[in-house]
Interface confidence: low
């Protein structure tokens, strides 16, 4: 940084004088103000005063024309000291070579050069490099050696010396702090290439420097205070859109907002996301709010950017007062599923149970009740009290509607809110068995031979549960015992029917009375087909012939 290439100056220069040759530059000027000076023959020793330096800018000045034949090379020393006179750099050797005269102009390789640099960078940061060529001899003379300079800067904000160009390499660097994309997004520099290392023929080009965005502006809430109204219990409900402004480049990480709920959300009821286009903060409910528990929440939301700030910036905070609106909430049956034991076959009008719901709302709402699903139509429900009564015969043995002794009913509770809301409950009636079914034989049709008849074994079934079942008893009625006998086996679950007298081939009714352990009696008529045959038969053969 604290070096300079040998400076070539053509002899017989016409001036005007003093003439700026090069700028001494110490990067220590970031930290302190620097004063520059030069020493050596041509400066402070004979021939004195040929060269001088602008002590504050470091510009090296030529005070009069040079005579190469008199002196071909000057060796000077550049010094940099702080305000208190302390040396901040080692002395720098400055070589000035007097060159031959020149008759060709330099040419830039492009009409327009383009480069970029981040806003807010420190002085000394390199931006871009420009190049010019010259047809003059650059081996034995400096006629073809090009020196670069900045002719002008547009705009001249915050001042007109924002950039410097390395005179020999063409590297353009930032020389001053204060690059601010939000104020000046682009600079146009008119650059010069001068042969004879800066004092020959000159040509110009344009260098366009784009100032790139850095996250040097914090997003700011506008407005900072919000009031919102949210119905209770709503999940995923948009509460409020929070608007921020950010001077950084739109749609960049330095502009895109990141929102954080800093306080007020004790129950973790809210969440906030960033809208991908508008950059707004969309505050929504993560859980349902409960008006009855808390009707107002005050949230504090902080906004930052996706990209970190490049310097310490104050963050903006918004306050959102969320008013929870009361909503007519559905009544809730207590318990949601109610198990009630009830005897089957209870009389019509007999109460079964009371099944009621509670309303979460604070005001005393009237709840009315209705049966929603009563597959067999056995029940009625008082709309005011929730009293469930029997209006049909509850039958545990009804396989169409009863499963595992349980009859399932769905009931509805409706409040008188506007609009009304409804809740459902399940009533599980466990039907207690009563001895309402007598035993029944199977099969109820038999075929039997009237010669050496085979005993007919009939299974006994009873839809009731123990103890209203076996052991069973059998009895023949209506004179059936004249021709038949009926005996129950030892296990008590089958009846053996035997033909004890000869009957002609025909169909007869056998009146069989079966009773269970609880003496519930059931009379069944067995259709007996008697055939003219011997022993076992399934269907009657043709007419039987004796002999």
């Amino acid at each position: 940084d604290w070096v300079v290439a040998p400076i070539s100056v053509p002899e017989n220069g016409k001036g005007p004088f003093p003439q700026r040759l090069n700028q001494l530059k110490s990067n220590k000027d970031r930290d302190t103000k620097i004063f520059y000076s030069i020493t050596g023959p041509g400066a402070d020793s004979p021939p004195e005063g040929v060269f001088a330096v602008e002590k504050e800018t470091g510009w090296l000045l030529l005070n009069k024309p040079l005579d190469r034949e008199e002196i071909a090379k000057y060796e000077l020393f550049g010094h940099a000291v702080s305000e208190n006179g302390a040396s901040v750099e080692d002395p720098m050797n400055i070589s000035i070579i007097v060159t031959d005269q020149n008759d060709h102009k330099p040419k830039f390789t492009q009409d327009t050069f383009r480069g970029s640099v981040l806003e807010g960078v420190l002085p000394g940061t390199s931006v871009m490099q420009v190049t010019a060529t010259d047809e003059d001899d650059a081996i034995y003379t400096y006629n073809g050696v090009v020196a670069y300079s900045i002719h002008s800067q547009e705009p001249k904000d915050p001042h007109d010396l924002m950039f410097t160009i390395h005179r020999s390499t063409g590297t353009i660097s930032v020389i001053s702090s204060g690059l601010d994309r939000e104020k000046v997004p682009e600079y146009t520099l008119t650059i010069q290439a001068t042969d004879m290392d800066g004092d020959g023929s000159t040509t110009t080009a344009v260098a366009v420097v784009e100032i790139l965005d850095a996250n040097d502006n914090a997003p700011m809430f506008d407005p900072q205070k919000y009031e919102a109204h949210v119905p209770e219990n709503a999940v995923g409900h948009e509460v409020q859109r929070l608007t921020v402004t950010d001077l950084d480049a739109p749609n960049s990480p330095a502009w895109r907002a990141t929102y954080l709920i800093m306080g007020g959300d004790d129950g973790d009821h809210f969440t906030i996301t960033t809208h991908p286009e508008s950059n707004q903060g969309i505050l929504t409910t993560r859980k349902g709010l409960d008006f009855e528990a808390k009707n107002q929440h005050t949230l504090y939301v902080e906004v930052t950017n996706e990209a970190p700030f490049v310097l310490k910036l104050p963050t903006s905070t918004a306050t959102i007062v969320v008013h929870v609106e009361d909503v007519n909430e559905a009544p809730v049956f207590v318990p949601p599923s109610k198990v009630v034991e009830v005897q089957e076959g209870i009389p019509t009008g007999e109460p079964v149970c009371v099944y009621t719901a509670e309303d979460p709302d604070k005001e005393n709402q009237k709840i009315s009740y209705r049966i929603l699903r009563d597959p067999a139509g056995w029940l009625a429900m008082d709309p005011d009290s929730g009293q469930v009564t029997a209006v049909g015969t509850l039958d545990r043995e009804d396989e169409q509607f009863v499963r595992n002794n349980i009859y399932e009913v769905m009931v509805l509770a409706m409040d008188n809110g506007s609009p009304p809301t409804t809740g459902t409950g399940t009533l599980l009636l466990t039907l207690i068995d009563v001895n309402d079914h007598g035993p029944v034989p199977e099969p109820r049709q038999i075929t039997i031979c009237n010669q050496s008849p085979v005993r007919q074994v009939l299974n006994i079934t009873d839809k009731d549960l123990s103890p209203h079942t076996s052991p069973f008893q059998a009895q023949l009625t209506d004179d059936s015992d004249i021709y038949w006998t009926a005996e129950v086996n030892e296990e008590g679950d089958t009846v053996v029917l035997s033909l004890k007298k000869f009957l002609k081939q025909d169909t007869y009714d056998v009146h069989l009375s079966l009773s269970d352990h609880g003496n519930k009696e059931q009379l069944t008529v067995i259709r007996a087909t008697v055939c003219d045959c011997h022993g076992h038969v399934e269907t009657c053969p043709g007419p039987w012939k004796g002999g």
Partner: antibody, heavy 122, light 108 residues
């Protein structure tokens, strides 16, 4: 068989009230909910409200709240619909409709009255 | 409130042809949808309930299908007595019970 027989046509002046009756027969009156639906000339069907003939509880469409009253008389198996503060746009045929009973929560309308034309005109 | 939308508003069909009427709900009504037929000067008559079950005495040429939000009433071969206005109605969410605006089936 199920029958719903409604009262005859009415002509009313704006601001007046009208009371339409619907007599049910052929089924157990208190076991089925009854609805009222109206149809303006050349228009579609618009639900007005429901009454539970068993307990007399009601629910009305928001549009008619404060203007409509539905009642029942179990001794005659009749439901009534009274609409007050009549205006010309209340000119319509008013139907009673019985709510069917299935295992679903809410039900369709399986039987309808023949309709009562109410004309509101000054 | 669930909004029921029927299409088309008017359907011109020749006798003996097939007619297909559509009904769309603004949100799911499961299978709790009914179709009614209304002839001039008469009360509506229940045709279909539960989206697809024919009511007592309704001819087999009437059939319903669909569930959720999209429903169809099909009349397989139109008879002269079938020319009328047809309404769909949801009974899944109440109040209110809501009807479609109707589809008029007219002779082509």
């Amino acid at each position: 068989q199920v029958q719903l027989v409604q009262s005859g046509a009415e002509v009313k002046k704006p601001g007046a009230s009208v009371k339409v009756s619907c007599k049910a027969s052929g089924y157990t009156f208190t076991s089925y909910y009854m609805h009222w639906v109206r149809q303006a000339p050349g228009q579609g069907l618009e639900w007005m409200g429901i009454i539970n003939p068993s307990g007399g509880s009601t629910s009305y469409a928001q549009k008619f709240q404060g203007r409509v009253t539905m009642t029942r008389d179990t001794s005659t198996s009749t439901v009534y619909m009274e609409l007050s503060s009549l205006r010309s746009e209340d000119t319509a045929v008013y139907y009673c409709a019985r709510e069917g009973y299935s295992s679903s929560w809410y039900d369709y309308f399986d039987y309808w009255g023949q309709g009562t034309l109410v004309t509101v005109s000054s | 409130e669930i909004v029921m939308t029927q299409s088309p508003a008017t359907l011109s069909v020749s006798p003996g042809e097939r007619a297909t009427l559509s009904c769309r709900a603004s949100q799911s009504v499961s299978s709790n949808l009914a179709w009614y037929q209304q002839k001039p000067g008469q009360a509506p008559r229940l045709l279909i309930y539960g989206a697809s079950t024919r009511a007592t005495g309704i001819p087999a040429r009437f059939s319903g299908s669909g569930s959720g939000t999209e429903f169809t009433l099909t009349i397989s071969s139109l008879q002269s007595e079938d020319f009328a206005v047809y309404y769909c109605q949801q009974y899944n969410n109440w109040p209110p019970w809501t009807f479609g605006q109707g589809t008029k089936v007219e002779i082509k």
